[in-house]
């Protein structure tokens, strides 16, 4: 099993541009999680899905952030417009 697959591995963009991060969860997993990690703020849960349905997006109250899971094998996290303080490592995770 390839595990969770994210793309892109690295992203550099200008402030104000749209950024889209993509995730392919492990096949058969029905929960998907997006996290953000920075030195200043630590690890933050942004949103999680269960059976493709968003359950809790309270970690991303800014409406610049949106996430979708159109099917069981794909999710996107979009930032529009992006800001310098969005610079972070974004993790996708999945679970049974």
């Amino acid at each position: 099993d390839a595990g969770v697959i994210q793309s892109p591995r690295h992203e550099v963009t200008e402030m104000g541009q749209e950024v889209t991060l993509r995730c392919k969860p492990i096949s058969g997993h029905n929960s998907l999680f997006w996290y953000r990690q920075t030195m200043m703020r630590g690890l933050e849960l942004l949103i999680y899905f269960n059976n493709n349905v968003p359950i809790d997006d309270s970690g991303m109250p800014e409406d610049r952030f949106s996430a979708k899971m159109p099917n069981a094998s794909f999710s996107t996290l979009k930032i529009q417009p992006s800001e310098p303080r969005d610079s972070a490592v974004y993790f996708c995770a999945s679970s049974l």
Epitope: L45, I55, S58, G59, P61, D63, E83
Partner: antibody, heavy 117, light 106 residues
């Protein structure tokens, strides 16, 4: 029925501290982000702070960072605001509000904080 | 911080009038949210995502706009609509409010 009930306000001297509480009922508290908003006498609304459902994401108004601390206890269905080094300009009605469709869809009735010597 | 400026700050109107309140943002926002507040009461959500009515809000209220400029319109004022209205943005923290528009009976 969604209910938010604030408490803990009162009269405090400048430099003093208060802890506000917001008791939630009528919904699954642990599934929602929560805000604090304040309103000085005769003035408009001022956003204070936000905390996500599991407390991993927290935001503050820039002017309040370092003096105010937001927290929550999901086992008690309660939101808190610890306010230290209080100033006269912190005098206001403090509201807690639930984050719904990004916006604040339910509000408490407010608790009054007066900072005066 | 993204500053929201509402105009007018005060508005006198009569029952049945059509009124429009404008909210301008110093930086572009994705959406605007509107609240109504009556004296001594907590604010009440009216409109979210610029144009969606909150549950229980009468259809005489509507919202529109994009970018830096947004509007709240009341198509035919009712006695219970006389209140103060606030816009708010959630595009970027801190989640600023406008200064408010007080709608008074003429």
């Amino acid at each position: 029925e969604v209910q938010l009930v604030e408490s803990g306000g009162g009269l405090v001297q400048p430099g003093g501290s208060l802890r506000l509480s917001c008791a939630a009922s009528g919904f699954t508290f642990s599934n929602f982000g929560m805000h604090w908003v304040r309103q000085a006498p005769g003035k408009g609304l001022e956003w204070v702070s936000y905390i996500s459902s599991g407390s991993s994401t927290i935001y503050y108004a820039d002017t309040l960072k370092g003096r105010f601390t937001i927290s929550r206890d999901n086992s008690k269905n309660t939101l808190y605001l610890q306010m230290n080094s209080l100033r006269a300009e912190d005098t206001a009605v403090y509201y807690c509000a639930r984050r719904g469709e990004k916006a604040m869809d339910y509000w408490g009735q407010g608790t009054t904080v007066t900072v005066s010597s | 911080d993204n500053q929201l400026t509402q105009s007018p700050s005060f508005l006198s109107a009569s029952v049945g009038d059509r009124v429009t309140i404008t909210c301008r943002a110093s930086s572009s926002v994705n959406y605007i949210y509107w609240y109504q507040q009556k004296p001594g009461k907590a604010p009440k959500l009216l409109i979210y995502y610029t144009s969606n009515l909150a549950p229980g809000v009468p259809s005489r209220f509507s919202g529109s706009g994009s970018g830096n400029e947004y509007t709240l319109t009341i198509s035919s004022l009712q006695p219970e609509d006389f209140a103060t209205y606030y816009c708010q943005q959630f595009t970027s923290s801190p989640f600023t409010f406008g200064q408010g528009t007080k709608l008074e009976i003429k």
